[in-house]
Interface confidence: low
Amino acid sequence: SAPGEDEECGRVRDFVAKLANNTHQHVFDDLRGSVSLSWVGDSTGVILVLTTFHVPLVIMTFGQSKLYRSEDYGKNFKDITDLINNTFIRTEFGMAIGPENSGKVVLTAEVSGGSRGGRIFRSSDFAKNFVQTDLPFHPLTQMMYSPQNSDYLLALSTENGLWVSKNFGGKWEEIHKAVCLAKWGSDNTIFFTTYANGSCKADLGALELWRTSDLGKSFKTIGVKIYSFGLGGRFLFASVMADKDTTRRIHVSTDQGDTWSMAQLPSVGQEQFYSILAANDDMVFMHVDEPGDTGFGTIFTSDDRGIVYSKSLDRHLYTTTGGETDFTNVTSLRGVYITSVLSEDNSIQTMITFDQGGRWTHLRKPENSECDATAKNKNECSLHIHASYSISQKLNVPMAPLSEPNAVGIVIAHGSVGDAISVMVPDVYISDDGGYSWTKMLEGPHYYTILDSGGIIVAIEHSSRPINVIKFSTDEGQCWQTYTFTRDPIYFTGLASEPGARSMNISIWGFTESFLTSQWVSYTIDFKDILERNCEEKDYTIWLAHSTDPEDYEDGCILGYKEAFLRLRKSSVCQNGRDYVVTKQPSICLCSLEDFLCDFGYYRPENDSKCVEQPELKGHDLEFCLYGREEHLTTNGYRKIPGDKCQGGVNPVREVKDLKKKCTSNFLSPEKQNSKSNSVPIILAIVGLMLVTVVAGVLIVKKYVCGGRFLVHRYSVLQQHAEANGVDGVDALDTASHTNKSGYHDDSDEDLL
């Protein structure tokens, strides 16, 4: 029988009446066009909906926007278009919502061609009131809030000027011209690249990287010959052109660009790219594209300084620059990532790591599923997950994998069961243990969302026909009940619930079509009466994460510690509530060799946890490039995995000695602060002075092991045995350029621009 249809299901009684009393319809009084929706603040209940309808005419675009506001999680909406003077809002800039609970909103208006600058509407009271402000420039990008101070905004203009506001968009100042890319760093620091000659494209690889820590009063040039840069966790990355050819290398800084080290990664050519797949304060997952148009590359994981890298996964699927990758951080369990590899026969297979990239394996076949036609052996196959790549290929996959940090262990995804991803219609699968085991949850493709920290899962069938039924489960997808939310089916366009999965409200968006007109409509359903009571202590059970062998004393140890969570029992139908906090008890593990990655110059043979010296480096002094100086390494081959908290047990010795030799080739790090007026002469002078140093630097780098394509296989191959290798919350990337991506964030050295 289909999942959830058996007699064991604990069904919610009288749910139809309970849901009917909590279903709220809102019909939007305008033509269909497009709709965008944003939550303003956390747990405020405030939603802004912007509908736009535009007709492109020969000379200009005629358009109309309407702005609606709800303060009860979408149950009721009020038309507030008059607050923005009925102005046409540019949808490509979206609604710029301020960080945390600042209550700030910026809408960017469409203005007629002849105007001096653009226009924005600003609110700092959760969109109750808006102030119109005319800009002294035409914005090229959405306004970017400083993560530390929501009054500080930056924007790029169509003329490539970098503009900053210190009073939430009231006054603007152009702090620099000829800017290609700008990003907020920590402590209200701004990083940006500039071009000297023609344009961003023309100067690619000859850009300069600048930093200002005082909102444009003073500047420091922290790099030249820049192709692009990216921020991830506490790391600042720059891809830098080599002196002699068209290759480029990654340099990394952990002090905001004051000092740089050359990452021990292969260099890439013009047609290749680097991409930061994930990063936090401990480490980085870096994708390095393979030469040629292969559609794949290699994932490397970094040490705690972002300098020494270990090969993590070969043949990682990543199509073209800025293309698609399935790399997904499973946020519901520490250390878990899912991605796809391109096998030798060009089929796509899903791989999962439970230890932050130490070892990758196939996903276990769901118990309640048969192997499909892609399987050679009908009894042995794996689950393969559909993510961004499948969606880009227009397979029947409406959603990427879903996990939430506060719904511990739950992962929901479309997939197929066989030897590779199938083009057949997928089903929906769920894991309740962070990806170790899977169960088929729903037949066929669905939209799905998690409510009340996992207490409720909601799904809607993906169909080309109008729909009027929603499914919900109160037991992590084991049993499902259906509710008809309207008599008149609608063309469904999306499920919307407040980010963070704490809400008990779900909004079903769609449109109705009649002979002459079509209108936007939303149905908001509140599940609070389904979960009638608050959860108590008896509703929770203790669950040891990453537990695979209960008889093993070290069971559950990942990255040097194990975590026991209090989790809601599947049989409990109660509210976790908006204030629910995940209860976990961490416990330190004793160190074993699995808590260490192989140090520079060492590698792990397959199926062995010991690190052995690389034959080609035996007897050589181990030297590598750190903070622009040659370092001598005394090691017995091990380095603690970033973020590993183990104590006691095995404790390999390691020592690094500064050789006082400069080795950062072709990278400029002037110590001098540049003021606005004198920056160019100083840079030119330094560049001149540096030419000699650069040549010397190249020779040193060539002599030692600080660079060069031949180094690829010198990084520790950790696929087999690093058992304790996970990190928390790796979603710390600057994702401004990836608003269209779902399910992963990446910062590629090309599509940053």
């Epitope: 203790i542 669950w543 040891l544 537990s547 062998d549 209960p550 008889e551 093993d552 004393y553 070290e554 069971d555 559950g556 140890c557 194990k562 026991a564 008890q585 961490p586 416990s587 330190i588 593990c589 004793l590 104590q647 006691g648 047990g649």
Partner: antibody, heavy 129, light 107 residues
Framework: QVQLVQSGAEVKKPGASVKVSCKAS????????MSWVRQAPGQGLEWMGI????????SYAQKFQGRVTMTRDTSTSTVYMELSSLRSEDTAVYYC??????????????????????WGQGTTVTVSS | EIVMTQSPATLSVSPGERATLSCRAS??????LAWYQQKPGQAPRLLIY???TRATGIPARFSGSGSGTEFTLTISSLQSEDFAVYYC?????????FGGGTKVEIK
């Protein structure tokens, strides 16, 4: 050899507090948890709580919650157990015991349990007015 | 919390005879169970861990068995030094709990 040496006997008045120390030697202090167990005269063993010497995190039995505080000093490899608001029924011998537990009393220590393999000699605490 | 019940409370056995002590858990503790021996005026001493593994230095006459909720400590041939109180203890779920003890006395 591995040993746990506890502080000497104490006589306290009701309402007072007592702080018992337990000094570990012969092994890496941070590699094992430490449990405290007490035994009233003529009675059985009663587990009070556990401390993880690495971070100092603790877990106490419900009965002692709010009255017991377990701390550690890694520089001297010593753990301490302080019991406040003493009453006559707290008269007992208090033991520290090395406990290799993986999950400190938070649950499912669902893996091989090695038992409290090394015990202190015990500290007699008498509560009397 | 998990309640551990030991039986009998007192066991009278002659030296050289076999002694069988029982320990029952109110819910499954898997094999996360230990047995201790305590003599008057002394601290407890670990005998068995993991339900069935003898601790270092414990004579072979002591053996443990069981899993889940039912456990047994067997002393195959009682020696004079074995007359003491024996406690079982679970470490499956916090708080750790001990049984009430079984006193093995000379018959």
């Amino acid at each position: 050899q591995v040993q746990l040496v506890q502080s000497g006997a104490e006589v306290k008045k009701p309402g007072a507090s007592v702080k018992v120390s337990c000094k570990a030697s012969g092994y890496t202090f941070t590699s094992r948890y430490m449990s405290w167990v007490r035994q009233a005269p003529g009675q059985g063993l009663e587990w009070m709580g556990i401390i993880n010497p690495v971070g100092g995190s603790t877990s106490y039995a419900q009965k002692f919650q709010g009255r017991v505080t377990m701390t550690r000093d890694t520089s001297t490899s010593t753990v301490y157990m302080e019991l406040s608001s003493l009453r006559s029924e707290d008269t007992a011998v208090y033991y520290c015991a090395r406990d290799p537990s993986g999950i400190a009393a938070a649950g499912p220590a669902s893996r091989y349990y090695y038992g409290m393999d090394v015990w202190g000699q015990g500290t007699t605490v008498t509560v009397s007015s | 919390e998990i309640v551990m019940t030991q039986s009998p409370a007192t066991l009278s056995v002659s030296p050289g005879e076999r002694a069988t002590l029982s320990c029952r858990a109110s819910q499954s503790v898997s094999s996360n169970l230990a047995w201790y021996q305590q003599k008057p005026g002394q601290a407890p001493r670990l005998l068995i861990y993991g339900a069935s593994t003898r601790a270092t230095g414990i004579p072979a006459r002591f053996s443990g068995s069981g899993s889940g909720t039912e456990f047994t400590l067997t002393i195959s041939s009682l020696q004079s030094e074995d007359f003491a109180v024996y406690y079982c203890q679970q470490a499956r779920l916090g708080p750790w709990t001990f049984g009430g003890g079984t006193k093995v006395e000379i018959k």
